[in-house]
């Protein structure tokens, strides 16, 4: 999906109002220094591409993120503010969701969510630069 036509201001507002709180709740009990940020993004569409990938694409050691509240909210936000996102992405993420087993917050998942927080912060910084 090409995130170029999204309403970035509205996505930022949703992130600051609600998604960020759920990400921080998920990370509770860990320190910001516990993980190094290894994933980066260069502009707003690129940041959303990386956020979409890390949130919804299962990895061998962390397959359960798409069921989390922050993931459901991310999906709703992208569906609302990125025209055409639902048609191309929702069915794919729905299929992934069905393939998942039990919900276990592993260290690897915490690391992945730490990366997500970094990507979202980067997304907001690139937004501020443009304004």
């Amino acid at each position: 999906y090409d995130f170029t036509n999204c309403d970035f201001q509205k996505i930022e507002a949703d992130y600051l109002r609600t998604i960020s709180k759920d990400l921080i709740t998920y990370m509770s009990g860990t320190k910001s220094t516990d993980f190094n940020n290894t994933v980066s993004c260069s502009n707003r569409p690129h940041c959303l591409t990386e956020i979409q990938s890390l949130t919804f694409n299962p990895t061998p050691r962390c397959a359960s993120l798409a069921k989390e509240m922050f993931a459901r909210k991310t999906k709703a936000t992208l569906a609302l503010w990125c025209p055409g996102y639902s048609e191309t992405q929702i069915n794919a993420t729905q299929a992934m969701k069905k393939a998942r087993k039990s919900k276990v917050t592993t260290n690897k998942c915490l690391e992945q969510v730490s990366q997500l927080l970094g990507l979202w912060r980067r997304f907001i910084r690139t937004l501020l630069k443009k304004q």
Partner: antibody, heavy 120, light 111 residues
Framework: QVQLVQSGAEVKKPGSSVKVSCKAS????????INWVRQAPGQGLEWMGV????????IYAEKFQGRVTITADTSTSTAYMELSSLRSEDTAVYYC?????????????WGQGTLVTVSS | QSALTQPPSASGSPGQSVTISCSGS?????????VSWYQQHPGKAPKLMIY???KRPSGVPDRFSGSKSGNTASLTVSGLQAEDEADYYC???????????FGGGTKLTVL
């Protein structure tokens, strides 16, 4: 049973406000969009706005901006539409309608409608 | 005044086909494949008949079909039946600001 049940008919004076409720049952309320659509007597459908409780987003039609407030109480699976500064042309049947989960732009479930009459 | 334009009326005899048009712009119908059609009988709530231009919800007869060309969407009812007599409204997604637009409605009469 999957349904939307709306509050009863209202008669209001010009200049006052009306608050219509829409109680959802049989589905996960928060993930869907709850839209409000009105229909004046003998007229067509007019979209007023939507709320997506999951992310707390509301979008209003430009015509109603500043006069309509849509809210939701996820604990009771109820959405509300409040319209202020009522005038006679606001006399209409007000419907709530469910916008599909993540596909918010089509309405697959409708409430029975609430008749609001504005008259002095 | 509606942002989407529909003919006020259409008619056909039982068994015939009738097509109702819905005209918009590149900002709504032409820009997205997000057109819906609703049927409304007098005194009843509307019912979704077609969504995403041409998809039918379960329970809607396959006599109802939708299509789109450029900025115009169409609803075709084939093999008309008496119970198809109703008002039909088109609707389109219109971007993240306007969100939803409705047509003015078409009264379908089965002769």
């Amino acid at each position: 049973q999957v349904q939307l049940v709306q509050s009863g008919a209202e008669v209001k004076k010009p200049g006052s406000s009306v608050k219509v409720s829409c109680k959802a049952s049989g589905f996960t309320f928060g993930s869907y969009g709850i839209n409000w659509v009105r229909q004046a007597p003998g007229q067509g459908l007019e979209w007023m706005g939507v709320i997506v409780p999951l992310v707390g987003v509301t979008i209003y039609a430009e015509k109603f901006q500043g006069r309509v407030t849509i809210t939701a109480d996820t604990s009771t699976s109820t959405a509300y539409m409040e319209l202020s500064s009522l005038r006679s042309e606001d006399t209409a049947v007000y419907y709530c309608a469910r916008g599909q989960e993540y596909f918010y732009w089509y309405f697959d479930l409708w409430g029975q409608g609430t008749l609001v009459t504005v008259s002095s | 005044q509606s942002a989407l334009t529909q003919p006020p009326s259409a008619s056909g005899s039982p068994g015939q086909s009738v097509t109702i048009s819905c005209s918009g712009s590149s900002s709504d119908i032409g820009g997205y494949n997000r057109v819906s059609w609703y049927q409304q009988h007098p005194g009843k709530a509307p019912k979704l008949m077609i969504y995403d231009v041409s998809k039918r919800p379960s329970g809607v007869p396959d006599r109802f079909s939708g299509s789109k060309s450029g900025n115009t969407a169409s609803l075709t009812v084939s093999g008309l039946q008496a119970e198809d007599e109703a008002d039909y409204y088109c609707s389109s997604y219109a971007g993240t600001d306007t969100f939803i637009l409705f047509g003015g409605g078409t009264k379908l009469t089965v002769l």
